[in-house]
Interface confidence: medium
């Protein structure tokens, strides 16, 4: 006898990173026939939705019209069919950005390098934060975490053409409150020192510093959000 239903999927639209005072919708996708969905925030019941008619709806939306630091944190959802509850979804880390200040991102030796060169990004912010985040834009965006009093180093090591792309950094006041993004820095990697055709689409980084964020980007929106479970956010655990 099945004691619980499969866990629902949870994600944020348009993004789990939400600028302060902007809107975000938390979506929870369960099963058709679910009579009740519950959204939990930081372990506490936050909202309830009862879809009508339940047999025609398998997804509910919880709209947040005004994002702020109080609403940033970990969300999960569950649903009920009859008297049977689902397993809880994975955790969704909702981050508020555009808090306080803007960091400066620089790259050494420069934004145009040859494949195989060692590249280091520097993120600097002169206000009270000691954690910094470096994001590479893209369909499967990576986030690297760094520490420092006013500046963090992000050594990429010897780069390949797979490192090409646009980078931004944030200062992090806590796990769920980030600064304004830095101005973007575009890294151009040229040359063919190694066989770059074998390079992965996104380079592999040390497991202790990198968490994979599956982001819905403007260029790669995927309608089946079950595949875009934004809770693969190991970084914020």
């Amino acid at each position: 006898q099945q004691q619980t239903l499969p866990k629902p999927f949870i994600w944020a639209e348009p993004h789990f990173m939400v600028p302060k005072e902007k809107q975000v919708t938390i979506c929870c996708q369960g099963n058709y026939g679910a009579v009740e969905y519950q959204l939990h925030f930081e372990g506490s019941l936050f909202a309830v939705d009862r879809p009508k008619p339940p047999e025609r709806i398998n997804k509910v939306q919880f709209y947040i019209p005004d994002m702020n630091s109080r609403m940033a944190g970990q969300y999960s959802c569950i649903y009920r069919v009859g008297e049977l509850w689902s397993e809880p979804s994975n955790l969704l880390d909702l981050v508020v950005t555009e808090m306080y200040d803007t960091p400066t991102l620089s790259v050494h030796p420069g934004p145009e390098v040859i494949s195989g060169e060692k590249v280091t990004f520097y993120c600097r912010l002169d206000t009270a934060t000691s954690m910094f985040l470096l994001l590479k834009e893209g369909r499967s965006s990576h986030v690297q975490r760094g520490y420092g009093k006013v500046q963090a180093e992000f050594p990429l090591g010897p780069v390949t053409t797979a490192h090409r792309g646009t980078y931004r950094c944030f200062g992090s006041y806590n796990n769920h409150a980030w600064s304004f993004p830095s101005e973007p820095v575009k890294l151009l990697v040229t040359g063919d020192i190694e066989n770059t055709s074998l390079a992965p689409e996104d380079p592999t980084f040390p497991a202790d510093t990198w968490g994979t964020y599956l982001l819905t980007t403007e260029t790669g929106l995927q309608k089946d959000h079950a595949l875009w479970d934004h809770t693969a956010q190991n970084l914020l655990r």
Epitope: F41, G43, F46, A47, F62, I64, P65, D66, M67, R70
Partner: antibody, heavy 122, light 107 residues
Framework: QMQLVQSGGGLVQPGRSLRLSCAAS????????IHWVRQAPGKGLEWVSG????????GYADSVKGRFTISRDNGKNSLYLQMNSLRAEDTAVYYC???????????????WGQGTMVTVSS | DIQMTQSPSSLSASVGDRVTITCRAS??????LAWYQQKPGKAPKLLIY???RLESGVPSRFSGSGSGTDFTLTISSLQPEDFATYYC?????????FGQGTKVEIK
């Protein structure tokens, strides 16, 4: 800074009506549910009524249901409580209070008005 | 409606004392509980929400704990400005309901 400024209290006879107002500033009024909470002299706090961020949902305590009406005008950043058929037991300080979370979540109240006294007596 | 019961209804304490106020819900409310401080003639002030999250600007000597039905507000070292009445409030379901209050007086 965020604040709620109340007006409209006073002395009223039983069976008569009164309208309370609450003007908001310093935050995005249209994003937050606002509630009324009252406190009878020497007593504790009692929730009276609430309205969600867009006015689409309202709620009332059983003791005022059918007599009080809550409304809001997001264009004017204002909240109202229309109190009809007032009774002696409605005598209290009435506070408007903002939900701590935008949207329709968690009715913990982080910003309160200064309170306005409503006295129902003949 | 969910009933909230606070204890004690009043207490006397001295500056520097550790003070604990408890609140019990008539049914489980997860951690959807807030604590307020109210001084005579003033509006209540939010101290703690979601049972243990300290409201911005509130001194760290205030802390909250608990989940389900039993909750605690602790003032680690009572200060002169802390003499007031404290209320718990559940924000789990409508209508939100308050405890009857605990008056903290000077010994």
């Amino acid at each position: 800074q965020m604040q709620l400024v109340q007006s409209g209290g006073g002395l009223v006879q039983p069976g008569r009506s009164l309208r309370l107002s609450c003007a908001a500033s310093g935050f995005t009024f249209s994003s937050y549910g606002i509630h009324w909470v009252r406190q009878a002299p020497g007593k504790g706090l009692e929730w009276v009524s609430g309205i969600n961020w867009n006015g689409g949902s309202t709620g009332y305590a059983d003791s005022v249901k059918g007599r009080f009406t809550i409304s809001r005008d997001n264009g004017k950043n204002s909240l109202y409580l229309q109190m009809n058929s007032l009774r002696a037991e409605d005598t209290a300080v009435y506070y408007c209070a903002k939900r701590a979370y935008s949207g329709d979540y968690y009715a913990a109240f982080d910003i309160w008005g200064q309170g306005t006294m409503v006295t129902v007596s003949s | 409606d969910i009933q909230m019961t606070q204890s004690p209804s009043s207490l006397s304490a001295s500056v520097g004392d550790r003070v604990t106020i408890t609140c019990r819900a008539s049914q489980g409310i997860s951690n959807a509980l807030a604590w307020y401080q109210q001084k005579p003639g003033k509006a209540p002030k939010l101290l703690i929400y979601a049972a243990s999250r300290l409201e911005s600007g509130v001194p760290s000597r205030f802390s909250g704990s608990g989940s389900g039905t039993d909750f605690t507000l602790t003032i680690s070292s009572l200060q002169p400005e802390d003499f007031a009445t404290y209320y718990c409030q559940q924000h789990y379901s409508t209508p939100p309901t308050f405890g009857q209050g605990t008056k903290v007086e000077i010994k």
